[in-house]
Interface confidence: medium
Amino acid sequence: AGVFELQIHSFGPGPGPGAPRSPCSARLPCRLFFRVCLKPGLSEEAAESPCALGAALSARGPVYTEQPGAPAPDLPLPDGLLQVPFRDAWPGTFSFIIETWREELGDQIGGPAWSLLARVAGRRRLAAGGPWARDIQRAGAWELRFSYRARCEPPAVGTACTRLCRPRSAPSRCGPGLRPCAPLEDECEAPLVCRAGCSPEHGFCEQPGECRCLEGWTGPLCTVPVSTSSCLSPRGPSSATTGCLVPGPGPCDGNPCANGGSCSETPRSFECTCPRGFYGLRCEVSGVTCADGPCFNGGLCVGGADPDSAYICHCPPGFQGSNCEKRVDRCSLQPCRNGGLCLDLGHALRCRCRAGFAGPRCEHDLDDCAGRACANGGTCVEGGGAHRCSCALGFGGRDCRERADPCAARPCAHGGRCYAHFSGLVCACAPGYMGARCEFPVHPDGASALPAAPPGLRPGDPQRYL
């Protein structure tokens, strides 16, 4: 037995371009917490497979509010270690998953909202009792720095926490038959003591206080023969008891399922049906209760407060998994029609529609000019999903409702004076200039730069902009 300990040193933007936005804002302050999941061996199991070695949640970190305009800094972390107790031997090789979760503290309906910020995973070799191992893992633009170690809980010692050591009974040497527990020279190795009353003939243990049954025997103390109907075993009945050993042992003999689990044989092995509050291949992983806060992302935890009654997480829309830890990618179903952009906001699905389309799923094709009258003789032109009015002379604005001031833009050049006219504007040109906007100089010989004056107009007359 022992404890795996994880110390998070920092969580923040990693090096290189593309620094992540801060997960918190003034409008949505938040705080971080971490979850660690351990599995024995160098497995490459899916993230949602059971954490057979154990799992732990950290406390919540300090509340953080982003400073406007500042890059995302290393975020404030929870105090203390994450500790994962392990009951059996430390396997030496293990796989880990460390998740960084954000708890949003804004005005959320139904309490704080949780979302997974980053998940890192790895496979490592680690001897129990060794020094802290340091590690850096990156997930996208985030970087997590942490240390970890495995330590044995007395009386266990050794690189796998398998040797049991107890204080010496005498100062000079270890008591009956016991080796010193190097490097703890003042402690001695001890054999195992099974659960009190465990049958010495038919029970055994590999952990102190345990009572595991040999094939053909059952019961908490392995005193009940599985079958007493006949003594068909080639080895015959035990001389120490009246029970018989059962021939043809099967995978469920001795009941490999711990904690009251029931065993059923499968073609290749066995399967344990665990009581509420336990899981694992042999129901060896002790229960998590609602008090441990196992439901993520605002999932509602239902279940008893004691380890014998399991919990069920009722997940909010957009999340699934036994702990509501998996976000449903609802956008993968492409619910937005007509090229709309899908936004999964967690609590809701939103479609951002292209111009010309509307509706919750962009299903409505807009007739841009339908019901859109352009005033003062303007005509409606459809295009690009937004209606546009082409206004009659003297009017402007989105719906041609504004009377235009044609002189507002000072259209007359070279000091010409502008006069508003019912049909537009008229420029009275300064001496030496001519043209609709007074843009052409009059040549000294009296000839115009224009090929000819329009009929009915003499050079020098005020020019009307037609």
Partner: antibody, heavy 120, light 112 residues
């Protein structure tokens, strides 16, 4: 019926390597600790190595520590002994044996043994 | 390590007579927490693997004839065959499993 069948023995030169296997049947292999015990020609029994039921703990005699590795594959019901840097004094019949339960228990079933001869 | 010493090295007994083999350990094999002696006795016939006879110093393995019995505690143990049969000719080993595993050197039992 409980059966343990060793294989992999043979003649090997000093410094060489050999891997012994022990195929188990007739019992729930994954519930029992297992050991390798050897017996030099005309000599007594010498325990070599032990492993607990789930493979998480190994134990070795001082004479083989660092050279031999015990392992098991519960999915194949097989026990292994990887022997490296073999010496002449490792010559023996190697038995695999089942403990009555955990490691701190007597050995109730033994295989027939496989002979390992280390000689140049 | 715990050293196991058997006596005698060899023994010749007439059929039907009592045979007694002794085993002494260099340290006590009695663990006070459970009051068990971590000692076993094995029988090995020529060309065969060992066979478990007795464990916990005095508990007979199932299928073993009741003429075999074990006794003793702490450091001194005895295997007794109350009435020797021809099939009992073998080498007998004591073994401790208190800390690691060690065997005695063996006692050869023959018919006188």
């Amino acid at each position: 019926e409980v059966q343990l069948l060793e294989s992999g023995g043979g003649l090997v030169q000093p410094g060489g390597s050999l891997r012994l296997s022990c195929a188990a049947s007739g019992f729930t292999f994954s519930s029992y600790a297992m050991s390798w015990v050897r017996q030099a020609p005309g000599k007594g029994l010498e325990w070599v190595a032990a492993i607990n039921s789930n493979g998480g703990r190994n134990y070795y005699a001082d004479s083989v520590k660092g050279r031999f590795t015990i392992s098991r594959d519960n999915s194949k019901n097989t026990l292994y002994l990887q022997m490296n840097s073999l010496r002449a004094e490792d010559t023996a019949v190697y038995y695999c044996a089942r403990h009555r339960g955990g490691y701190y228990y007597a050995m109730d079933y033994w295989g027939q043994g496989t002979l390992v001869t280390v000689s140049s | 390590d715990i050293v196991m010493t058997q006596s005698p090295d060899s023994l010749a007994v007439s059929l039907g007579e009592r045979a007694t083999i002794n085993c002494k350990s260099s340290q006590s094999l009695l663990y006070s927490s459970n009051q068990k002696n971590y000692l076993a006795w094995y029988q090995q016939k020529p060309g065969q693997p060992p066979k478990l006879l007795i464990y916990w110093a005095s508990t007979r393995e199932s299928g073993v004839p009741d003429r075999f019995s074990g006794s003793g505690s702490g450091t001194d143990f005895t295997l007794t065959i109350s009435s020797l049969q021809a099939e009992d000719v073998a080498v007998y080993y004591c073994q401790q499993y208190y800390t690691y595993l060690t065997f005695g050197q063996g006692t050869r039992l023959e018919i006188k």
